[in-house]
Amino acid sequence: APVRSLNCTLRDSQQKSLVMSGPYELKALHLQGQDMEQQVVFSMSFVQGEESNDKIPVALGLKEKNLYLSCVLKDDKPTLQLESVDPKNYPKKKMEKRFVFNKIEINNKLEFESAQFPNWYISTSQAENMPVFLGGTKGGQDITDFTMQFVSS
């Protein structure tokens, strides 16, 4: 069975949008008007993972690109990256753990926890135009809350 996916955009709780910054990085910045077309569209796939009553495992691919957000250790630190995959094999229901995020909904906001590194979250900085990264703190300076906007296929 093909994995169930939906197309969406994400904005952090300060309404910053996510855009490509070079071939393998995302950054967060405020966009308006026609510039909104720059924001990345994700293909969010519902995959197998350590699902709970309040966590839904998903993979976040870039729509019509063979790139997925993944979590790996770099210099002993959990790190967010965009990883290139074989489009013939992805997306799939049984994604490798590094590609899986636990989507957590709290007060109409979403958090994306790394399945590979529990308590590490997709994060943005308060500052404009900074990379999207994997952060190990919630409720601090960095932003871990997002809203999702559905995009029609």
Partner: antibody, heavy 122, light 107 residues
């Protein structure tokens, strides 16, 4: 060798809370999930819910409001609590280890305890 | 939730017979189906995972096949110790759901 052993009172009064413990050996509870399954006398198997290695839980909808699954990794024990029991909760209760093989076979249950019969009666 | 339809619910057979049990799921589950054997007073034992993968130590007379929504479990030549109840389980998504069981009895 992987082993799971359920324990707890065999008789619980209606409206009280059923409490069971699953003690495991041969694997670490921080690495593998554990499910609870029950089987009423002469009937089929019903999956109750599970607790993952990281401590997150998934409860099957029919029992969700009455169910608590928790664990103590250091004691290698998983506990099940089911509140407000009725005669319909009379069953053999099993705990089972999840395979936890990411990107291959995450949700299967490969090793089971021998089960413990719980009777709900006054 | 995924609904499971297992048939037959009971089956009488003789030693040496070939026996087939089927399991149908309400949704496509790829190959995420397991088969368990349960003897009276004992815990279920996993025989086959992922539709066709024989677990270590399980005799080769047991086999499984199928994908999507239709699955088959076969015992090629029944042995006296095979008389038991057999259950299918979908391991595609939570909540996990079992078939109703097939009781295999001596004819």
């Amino acid at each position: 060798e992987v082993q799971l052993q359920e324990s707890g009172p065999g008789l619980v009064k209606p409206s009280e809370t059923l409490s069971l413990t699953c003690t495991v050996s041969g694997f670490s509870l921080s690495d593998f999930g554990v499910s609870w399954i029950r089987q009423p006398p002469g009937k089929g198997l019903e999956w109750i819910g599970l607790i993952w290695g990281g401590g997150d839980t998934y409860y099957n909808s029919p029992l969700k409001s009455r169910l608590t699954i928790s664990k103590d990794n250091s004691k290698s024990q998983v506990s099940l609590k089911l509140s407000s029991v009725t005669a319909a909760d009379t069953a053999v209760y099993y705990c089972a280890k999840q395979t936890n093989l990411w990107a291959y076979d995450l949700y299967s249950m490969d090793y089971w305890g021998q089960g413990t019969l719980v009777t709900v009666s006054s | 939730d995924i609904q499971m339809t297992q048939s037959p619910s009971s089956l009488s057979a003789s030693v040496g017979d070939r026996v087939t049990i089927t399991c149908q799921t309400s949704q496509d589950i790829d190959e995420d189906l397991n088969w368990y054997q349960q003897k009276p007073g004992k815990a279920p034992k996993l025989l086959i995972s992922l539709a066709s993968n024989l677990r270590p130590g399980v005799p080769s007379r047991f086999s499984g096949s199928g994908s999507g929504t239709d699955f088959t479990f076969t015992i090629s030549s029944l042995q006296p110790e095979d008389f038991a109840t057999y259950y299918c389980l979908q391991s595609d998504r939570l909540p996990l759901t079992f078939g109703q069981g097939t009781k295999l009895e001596i004819k």
